[in-house]
């Protein structure tokens, strides 16, 4: 009998408001046994996969997706999904990445700490959850 897969979580380090040109790392978390984590951008047509999965705790695995130099075009909604054979999980909530001018005037927001349940997350649309394994090579733009 197939197990019910818990939804993944997503967070961002060092936060969700990133100065232009700085780096950000998205962290996806799921259960032990995940083979592929996928970071999706805005819609499922743009994504990056990784099999570099490591332990986050005795009961959790995680993967990290790093953008070395954030551009304005990187702003947007991100979410995670994972493949634990024989199926894909549901998507995580959305995390919104905001990109600010690096000069940073007095009114510009400070970098928010990374959070898997912060105010920049939006519920994901799980109305269509058909995903093929990464090994089948879905055509998609890459995030970076």
């Amino acid at each position: 009998q197939e197990e019910d897969l818990p939804r993944p979580s997503i967070s961002a380090e060092p936060g969700t408001v990133i100065p232009l040109g700085s780096h950000v790392t998205f962290v996806c978390r799921g259960p032990v046994g995940v083979q592929t984590f996928r970071l999706e951008r805005d819609s499922r047509s743009t994504y990056n996969d990784t099999e570099d999965v490591s332990q986050a705790s005795p009961s959790e695995s995680e993967a990290r997706f790093r953008i070395d130099s954030v551009r304005e075009g990187n702003a947007g909604l991100y979410r995670c999904i994972y493949y634990k054979p024989p199926k894909w999980s549901e998507q995580s909530d959305y995390l919104e990445l905001l990109v600010k001018e690096s000069s940073g005037g007095p009114d510009s927001p400070d970098t928010e700490p990374g959070s898997s349940a912060g105010p920049t997350q939006r519920p994901s649309d799980n109305s269509h959850n058909e995903h093929a394994p990464a090994s089948q090579g879905l055509k998609a733009e890459h995030l970076y």
Partner: antibody, heavy 117, light 107 residues
């Protein structure tokens, strides 16, 4: 189909050096952490080293027995994994396997390193 | 470092029987455990990952159980090709240590 092909093994004298290579194909190499595992003749398996992906800053990890003597590296553009072995000891004699993660799923056929005077 | 103690080192059994191998971790590793089979002169093959998940193409007579520090690996209804060596490995933290191995022999 996944293929991992190790090369570079051979006979080397104690305190000598050797560089092993592993050519990967059939999977997305640059999104996989990679490992070296060895097995001395008639003995069990020993994990040697691991290198993570670019998103993890190519972090490296080593067994205590090889720390400061062995260096793991990778070339994502060529889908190649390497193990530079310096100051070799007789106890480094083993079959060396290139192994993909996350769960040591795919193994190469191995390359034999013999350290002997 | 996490030590993995695998037992027995060798075991004799008959065709059709069941055998169980145990692996004990020196500290809790959740379910970050894998089991491998190795045939003479061949590379190891992943059988079980995440303590209980069967790898692709592995027959269902192989199974894994356990979490925390105690893990078991069972082969039900032994076939002739199963009389080889088996290893556990913890994947929780580096160094990713293996158990000492178990050699199955035909009784």
């Amino acid at each position: 189909e996944v293929h991992l092909v190790e090369t570079g093994g051979g006979l080397v004298q104690p305190k000598g050096s050797l560089k092993l290579s592993c050519a990967a194909s059939g999977f997305n190499f640059n999104t996989n952490a990679m490992n070296w595992v060895r097995q001395a003749p008639g003995k069990g398996l020993e994990w040697v080293a691991r290198i993570r992906t670019k998103s993890n800053n190519y972090a490296t990890y080593y067994a205590d027995s090889v720390k400061d003597r062995f260096t793991i590296s990778r070339d994502d553009s060529q889908s190649m994994l390497y193990l530079q072995m310096n100051n070799l000891k007789t106890e480094d004699t083993a079959m060396y396997y290139c192994v993909s993660t996350p769960y040591f799923t795919y193994w190469g056929q191995g390359t034999l390193v013999t350290v002997s005077a | 470092d996490i030590q993995m103690t695998q037992s027995p080192a060798s075991q004799s059994a008959s065709l059709g029987e069941s055998v169980t191998i145990t692996c004990l971790a020196s500290q809790t590793i959740g379910t970050w455990l894998a089991w491998f089979q190795q045939k003479p002169g061949k590379s190891p093959q992943l059988l079980i990952y995440a303590a209980t998940s069967l790898a692709d193409g592995v027959p269902s007579r192989f199974s894994g159980s356990g979490s925390g520090t105690k893990f078991s690996f069972k082969i039900s209804s032994l076939q002739a090709e199963d009389f080889v060596s088996y290893y556990c490995q913890q994947l929780y933290s580096a160094p990713y240590t293996f158990g000492g191995g178990t050699k199955l022999e035909i009784k």
